[in-house]
Interface confidence: low
């Protein structure tokens, strides 16, 4: 057959779906690879073809669209499973073609088992809620397109394994789950089970997400440099190791990039000739406030190095701060015999 633009295996879209539940999978060609949509392609006389390779096999096979109860079907650019089976796991390819044009992409589909408490190897999306911030909601994700707006599904919410009923500060409201005042104790996995009828059958959609309660923007402050500070003087003799920690606290800020860096005499360490190393460590509080420590180290400090200016800088979306370390050369202790001799007028 003629050449086909092959976009390969799109591992960025590792699709995971639950066993024995409906799944609708859009052909990624129109979402990520081509500059036109399915309707345009269809109008231009292009045909969308689906096939697959089973797990641990190399052989490409056509998808069987003649299964009982139309278990697998195609509708426009969507491949439907009603429902999935465990052995549907594999690499799926959608190919758009006519006599003169061909483009295709493959993507992995993994059918995942869940247990009676919704535990599974499924990668869970994380939803961050601000601590003590007023009413916040999470919405049951990825359920659009499974049933028409005329169908009214039933939605049940769970925290971990337990149905959410009479919880103090968590209220199910259909597709939404409202947190009146989010607290650390609300951290955990939340599952919505959407049940809807279709052609005399009942289907369930299970969606689990992780809620992480984080610091509120109301409490956010610019970076705070705990070290260096005015109380600590780094007093060294030439030849000793100089170690200066820069420890900075950052409030949690959604999508903020926290940065810490040193300057020596106004230059970045990389831009000067002295042998300096910098090691960084990061720790987080339960609400994802961050403490970054960068330790500046000069193995054998010279008297020149002890005259330089060492400044720690920090920046977040809330602002930028800097603090100089107090570095000085240790005054040598008096050499007793010489001073004593001088004291007695020895020459």
């Amino acid at each position: 057959s003629e050449r086909c633009d092959d976009w390969g295996l799109d591992t960025m879209r590792q699709i995971q779906v639950f066993e024995d539940e409906p799944a609708r999978i859009k052909c990624p060609l129109f979402e990520h690879f081509l500059k036109f949509n399915y309707s345009t392609a269809h109008s231009a006389g292009l045909t969308l073809i689906w096939y697959w390779t089973r797990q641990d096999r190399d052989l490409e096979e056509p998808i069987n669209f003649r299964l009982p109860e139309n278990r697998i079907s195609k509708e426009k650019d969507v491949l439907w499973f009603r429902p999935t089976l465990l052995n549907d796991t594999g690499n799926y390819t959608c190919m758009l073609r006519n006599t003169t044009y061909c483009s295709k992409v493959a993507f992995p589909l993994e059918v995942v088992q869940k247990d009676s408490c919704f535990n599974s190897p499924m990668k869970l999306p994380v939803h961050k809620l601000y601590i003590e911030y007023g009413i916040q909601r999470i919405t049951c994700p990825n359920v659009d397109g499974y049933f028409p707006s005329s169908v009214k599904p039933t939605i049940t919410w769970y925290m971990g394994c337990y149905k959410i009923q009479n919880f103090n500060n968590v209220i199910p409201e259909g597709m939404n789950l409202s947190f009146l005042i989010a607290l650390i104790s609300n951290n955990g996995n939340y599952t919505c089970v959407v049940t809807y009828p279709e052609n005399g059958r009942t289907f369930h959609l299970t969606r689990t997400l992780t809620v992480k309660v984080v610091g509120s923007p109301k409490n956010a402050v610019p970076p705070v440099i705990h070290s260096p500070n005015d109380h600590v003087v780094y007093e060294k003799e030439p030849g000793e190791e100089l170690l200066i920690p820069c420890t900075v606290y950052f409030s949690f800020l959604m999508d903020s990039r926290n940065e810490v860096w040193w300057t020596i005499d106004g230059k970045k360490p990389d831009d000067i000739t002295i042998d300096v190393t910098i090691n960084e460590s990061i720790s987080h509080s339960r609400t994802e406030d961050e403490t970054r420590t960068q330790i500046l180290s000069i193995k054998k400090v010279t008297s020149e190095d002890l005259k330089r200016s060492y400044v720690c800088h920090a920046r977040s979306a809330k602002g930028e701060v800097a603090k100089a370390a107090k570095v000085k050369q240790k005054v040598p202790a008096p050499r007793y015999t010489v001073e004593l001799a001088c004291g007695f007028g020895a020459t």
Epitope: Q113, K114, D115, S116, N119, G160, G188
Partner: antibody, heavy 122, light 113 residues
């Protein structure tokens, strides 16, 4: 060799407490492991006590009778499962097994320890 | 409470016999097939034989088989061997949302006739 080894079983008076440990060797707890405690009273059958899903601290389950008295926990860095037993009664006398269910999805307990004996008696 | 009823509680059989043990749950196991079977010998830990109602665990001889769905399950030993004399337990997994997650049957002791 892959194995689970329980320890901490002892003779304890009614009302007392005991902490059982289960150390895994040859494997690390993975996020899809269901780690559980099962007990067996002398001459009796198996009885489920509690499970913890290693992937999520939310997922902790107890038999109805164990709620409030027993606490399951784990330390993944030490590859160890624990069972804290408080307010012990004579009927808690049993061999306590720890068991692992890989995948936690109806796969059964494919790995068991040899058990540790807890005797509750005055 | 969930009850798993195993029958018979004990049975006498000879080497070469076909042995059938049944297990009935007071409510459907999760996914209709979350049922396992174990063999236990005196002084030893249980050993997994069958999971998901009918799947043979690794290293288990093919003379063992399981069947059933929902609430009623069967373990069959097609031709009893000397090493098969032991106690057998069924174990169901249930929805933890509404009940205890896991329950064991009372056991069936298979003894030499």
């Amino acid at each position: 060799e892959v194995q689970l080894e329980e320890s901490g079983g002892d003779l304890v008076q009614p009302g007392g407490s005991l902490r059982l440990s289960c150390a895994a060797s040859g494997i690390s707890f993975s996020s899809s492991d269901f780690m559980c405690w099962v007990r067996q009273a002398p001459g009796k059958g198996l009885e489920w006590v509690s499970c913890i899903y290693a992937g999520s601290s939310v997922s902790i389950y107890y038999a109805t009778w164990a709620k409030g008295r027993f606490t399951i926990s784990r330390d993944n860095s030490k590859n160890t499962l624990y069972l804290q037993m408080n307010s012990l009664r004579a009927e808690d006398t049993a061999v306590y097994f720890c068991a692992r269910s890989t995948g936690s999805v109806g796969r059964g307990f494919n790995l068991w320890g040899q058990g540790t004996l807890v005797t509750v008696s005055s | 409470d969930i009850v798993m009823t195993q029958s018979p509680s004990s049975l006498s059989a000879s080497v070469g016999d076909r042995v059938t043990i049944t297990c009935q749950a007071s409510q459907s196991v999760y996914n209709s097939n979350h049922l396992s079977w174990y063999q236990q010998k005196p002084g030893q830990a249980p050993k997994l034989l069958i999971y998901s109602a009918s799947t043979l665990a690794s290293g288990v001889p093919s003379r063992f088989s399981g069947s059933g769905s929902g609430t009623d399950f069967t373990l069959t030993i097609s031709s009893l061997q000397p090493e098969d004399f032991a106690t057998y337990y069924c174990q169901g997994e249930f929805s933890c949302v509404s009940a205890d997650c896991i329950a064991f049957g009372g056991g069936t002791k298979v003894v030499i006739k």
